[in-house]
Amino acid sequence: CPTSCKCSSARIWCTEPSPGIVAFPRLEPNSVDPENITEILIANQKRLEIINEDDVEAYVGLRNLTIVDSGLKFVAYKAFLKNSNLRHINFTRNKLTSLSRRHFRHLDLSDLILTGNPFTCSCDIMWLKTLQETKSSPDTQDLYCLNESSKNMPLANLQIPNCGLPSARLAAPNLTVEEGKSVTLSCSVGGDPLPTLYWDVGNLVSKHMNETSHTQGSLRITNISSDDSGKQISCVAENLVGEDQDSVNLTVHFAPTITFLESPTSDHHWCIPFTVRGNPKPALQWFYNGAILNESKYICTKIHVTNHTEYHGCLQLDNPTHMNNGDYTLMAKNEYGKDERQISAHFMG
């Protein structure tokens, strides 16, 4: 554990001003596993001025970071890139003159406390004003910045020309496409400062490529996979002040596939279990020994679970006998195609 600090299996705290620390605390190899550290508390460290890009990355489990009454002046943009579990940050009473939202945009923070820092009034910190305005009143902090006259000014009163939130607009509000086909999405962004445009495609499986020029962007998705049905695609405009996004849900239409059909199992009823994928929802028809199976209250199809474009169910049979032994074929069809799958069922005798 670094000098002036104390360490436990989950916590590091550095509060002794003397001799103090000049760099962010790092654990010695073969000591405590940094991944298990959930809280770091630093106080009274006047010589701690910088958090570098790689200082915090080892603490992937970190939830609470507190640096108070210290000399923190600069935080590298990518300092918290690997710390996706961070929920609470407290940088009260440090020497921060600026702080970008780029530090925190990927984090799901519950608290970001920044009171008592000598921020410079500029567009760079306008995002903090916007953040304050979106918070409910009990959570707001008294934040100030120094104007050109070196006067303290409440951040709530900050007015900077040509410094506002951007906007993003997608051309396609809803997007329905057939599996295997391609589609191009267009997006336009605007704002001052001029925003950058990027696409958030989440875990899209289909091959995609984007082209961006200034305020226009296009995303081409090719050979669209049925696995991408229901996924959201967003066009994001981002500048110093904040971001705006416009989203579209992708609906992929595709022919049915019976991915699972098994021999009957007995529970409360007998059940021939199946799973069918398809969009739009496939119509199901059973055949028994090649002939149409006439469903009734004693033999009927039940869908138990619907998972977007996947349907899990049973052909439910009440008290089947040897008369029900034979080949059962499930046919699933929609306007994009069909599939059949057969099993042999032996109930008794």
Epitope: T259, A291, E295, K338, D339
Partner: antibody, heavy 119, light 112 residues
């Protein structure tokens, strides 16, 4: 022996309706879908629609929606197709055909019913 | 809608000769899971109803002579008659059953 026996030829006036029958024998009507197919003189075959005789569920070729209505009478093992608002374009031979192999293929066909629409 | 195109529209051959006719679909008729093609061939002799010859693109219907062979996959299919007989005079239609049902325009086979 499986047989599909269709009703005889029809001569009707434009604007009228007609109901063609198809009586199934040699098998249980409710075991197979019944399909209807149109063949205009010297032309190819066009699928009109099919019916599940168990529950009366139908599907139609979009072109024939509103023109054809398919029904069955299980007690007499007979399938019917009604054609309405007839025009000369409806003059053709109409076949019923049994849907086999999970209703993908038509293994038995009726002998055809000739419909002539003329004033 | 799936469009079925047949060629040639007609052909004339002598008895004993081999004949092939083609059927193309506007989209694939292949079920990628089962590897089955939803394609059939029908024979319609003059004044008669159509008769099922081949289903699943290559399975011969019972009672159909083995000189009739179906082949192909996806979008391109062929019906071959290895040694044409006089009684094979007919129109031959292909039909898809992957999305509803569509017939081709037919190939008229004449015997010289």
């Amino acid at each position: 022996e499986v047989q599909l026996q269709q009703s005889g030829p029809e001569l009707v006036k434009p604007g009228a309706s007609v109901k063609i029958s198809c009586k199934a024998s040699g098998y249980t009507l409710t075991d197979y879908y019944m399909n209807w197919v149109k063949q205009s003189h010297g032309k190819s075959l066009e699928w009109i629609g099919d019916i599940n005789p168990n529950n009366g569920g139908t599907s139609y070729n979009q072109k024939f929606k509103g023109k054809a209505t398919l029904t069955v009478d299980k007690s007499s093992s007979t399938a019917y197709m009604e054609l309405r608002s007839l025009t000369s374009e409806d003059s053709a031979v109409y076949y019923c055909a049994r849907g086999a192999y999970y209703s993908n293929y038509f293994d038995y066909w009726g002998q055809g019913t000739t419909l002539t629409v003329s004033s | 809608d799936i469009v079925m195109s047949q060629s040639p529209s007609s052909l004339a051959v002598s008895a004993g000769e081999k004949v092939t006719m083609s059927c193309k679909s506007s989209q694939s008729l292949l079920n990628s899971r089962t590897r089955k093609n939803y394609l059939a061939w029908y024979q319609q002799k003059p004044g008669q109803s159509p008769k099922l010859l081949i289903y699943w693109a290559s399975t011969r219907e019972s009672g159909v002579p083995d000189r009739f062979t179906g082949s192909g996959s996806g979008t391109d299919f062929t019906l071959t008659i290895s040694s044409v007989q006089a009684e094979d005079l007919a129109v031959y239609y292909c039909k898809q059953s992957y999305i509803l049902f569509t017939f081709g325009s037919g190939t008229q086979l004449e015997i010289k």
